[in-house]
């Protein structure tokens, strides 16, 4: 009976996500058969989050909207380890919007999910950010410095990275 009600709960939770994600890839967390963590297929997973590389070229605002339609946000990068994971799936000749912007052009950078902006955990290329007109952040590859962040005009279309919390069922 317990297993039955657990299965029913799982199914209803899966139905919730079905509108965004017709298929999920789930893995067993730990030793308990009852704890599963899932990411939409073909998203990738790292720690407690799922990531999707959107190859469509859109403005920052449209990219964020695109992520939110899928129940996600443009990516918020919290650690070097997280960035190192993300870049494994990126193409060196492309740039990708992050969930980081400076809406008023005052050098007051903010993350889309309101995570406090911490200057000590940023990975700007050297000399970046450097322009009051460039209010959105991308991650891109520079031969001299590998992967890092750069500020650019928000309306210039780029690829993007979406991030959402893992789905636990």
């Amino acid at each position: 009976n317990f297993m039955y009600s657990k299965t029913v709960k799982r199914l209803s939770k899966l139905r919730e996500y079905q509108q965004y994600h017709p298929s999920l890839t789930c893995v067993m967390e730990g030793k308990d058969i009852e704890d599963w963590s899932c990411c939409p297929t073909p998203w990738t997973s790292f720690q407690s989050s799922c990531y999707f590389i959107s190859t469509g070229m859109q403005s920052w605002t449209k990219s964020q909207k695109n992520c939110s339609v899928m129940g996600a946000d443009l990516v918020v990068i919290n650690t070097r380890e997280e960035q190192d994971f993300i870049i494994q799936n990126l193409k060196r000749n492309s740039s990708y919007f992050l969930g980081l912007s400076d809406p008023g052009g005052r050098r007051h950078w903010q993350w889309v999910d309101q995570t406090p902006y911490n200057e000590n955990v940023t990975f700007w290329h050297s000399g970046e950010p450097n322009n009051l007109d460039e209010r959105c952040a991308i991650i891109n590859f520079r031969s001299s410095e590998e992967w890092g962040w750069n500020d650019i005009h928000c309306h210039v279309p780029q690829k993007s990275i979406c991030k959402m919390k893992k789905i636990y069922i």
């Epitope: 005052r106 050098r107 000399g127 450097n130 322009n131 009051l132 007109d133 005009h153 309306h155």
Partner: antibody, heavy 118, light 107 residues
């Protein structure tokens, strides 16, 4: 080539307002914000503020809030600055300057002289 | 606001001389230091940005250096057309601020 053409010299009475203009050409106007700078004998160069030619929002030096109002007209690729309630302290040369990379003003207008005198 | 100090307000030098103009910020400005030249007719031009990068079309006799709070502009071979007033400006923090200027004259 990049050019910023400012309006001509103004001689105005105390208490009135004046609006000076800066027409940008030779580049994509909305890709670069416009700064305004005051030069008076007493104070060397002072940054008044900057207006985004794309978004239309602006950042002012606290000292010039209430004194200066910056606007843009995208269709004519012109930036404007209005100075209100003029006093002799406002007599100066005013420059517009284009925003550039590395927090710099990369091209400047020729300056507009404003003289406040009764 | 960040204060920018150009301790020398005027400087006299001979043609061909090497001239150095200094600028000090009241706090670290992370190399966001720019130099402008204002000719006697009022024309203002950007010379150097981000401490040491030469703006388009600026002769290579101009160079910049510095870090933290202390910066300098050097003209290596003074030319007649360099007669002007030179201003430093910090772009690290709004409001942007300028030094008081250094007027360069020929001996």
């Amino acid at each position: 080539q990049v050019q910023l053409q400012q309006s001509g010299a103004e001689l105005v009475r105390p208490g009135v307002s004046v609006k000076i203009s800066c027409k940008g050409s030779g580049y994509t106007f909305t890709d670069y914000s416009m700064h305004w700078v005051k030069q008076s004998h007493a104070k060397s160069l002072e940054w008044i503020g900057v207006i985004s030619t794309y978004y239309g929002d602006s950042n002012y030096n606290q000292k010039f809030k209430g004194k200066a109002t910056m606007t843009v007209d995208k269709s004519s690729t012109t930036a404007y600055m209005e100075l209100a309630r003029l006093t002799s302290e406002d007599s100066a040369i005013y420059y517009c300057a284009r925003n550039g990379n590395f927090y710099v003003m990369d091209y400047w207008g020729q300056g507009t002289s404003v003289t406040v005198s009764s | 606001d960040i204060q920018m100090t150009q301790s020398t307000s005027s400087l006299s030098a001979s043609l061909g001389d090497r001239v150095t103009i200094t600028c000090q910020a009241s706090q670290d400005i992370s190399n966001y230091l720019n130099w402008y030249q204002q000719k006697p007719d009022g024309t203002v031009k950007l010379l150097i940005y981000y401490t040491s990068r030469l703006h388009t079309g600026v002769p290579s006799r101009f160079s910049g250096s510095g870090s933290g709070t202390d910066y300098s502009l050097t003209i290596s071979n003074l030319d007649q057309e360099d007669i002007a007033t030179y201003y430093c400006q910090q772009g690290n923090t709004l409001p942007w601020t300028f030094g008081g200027g250094t007027k360069l004259e020929i001996k």
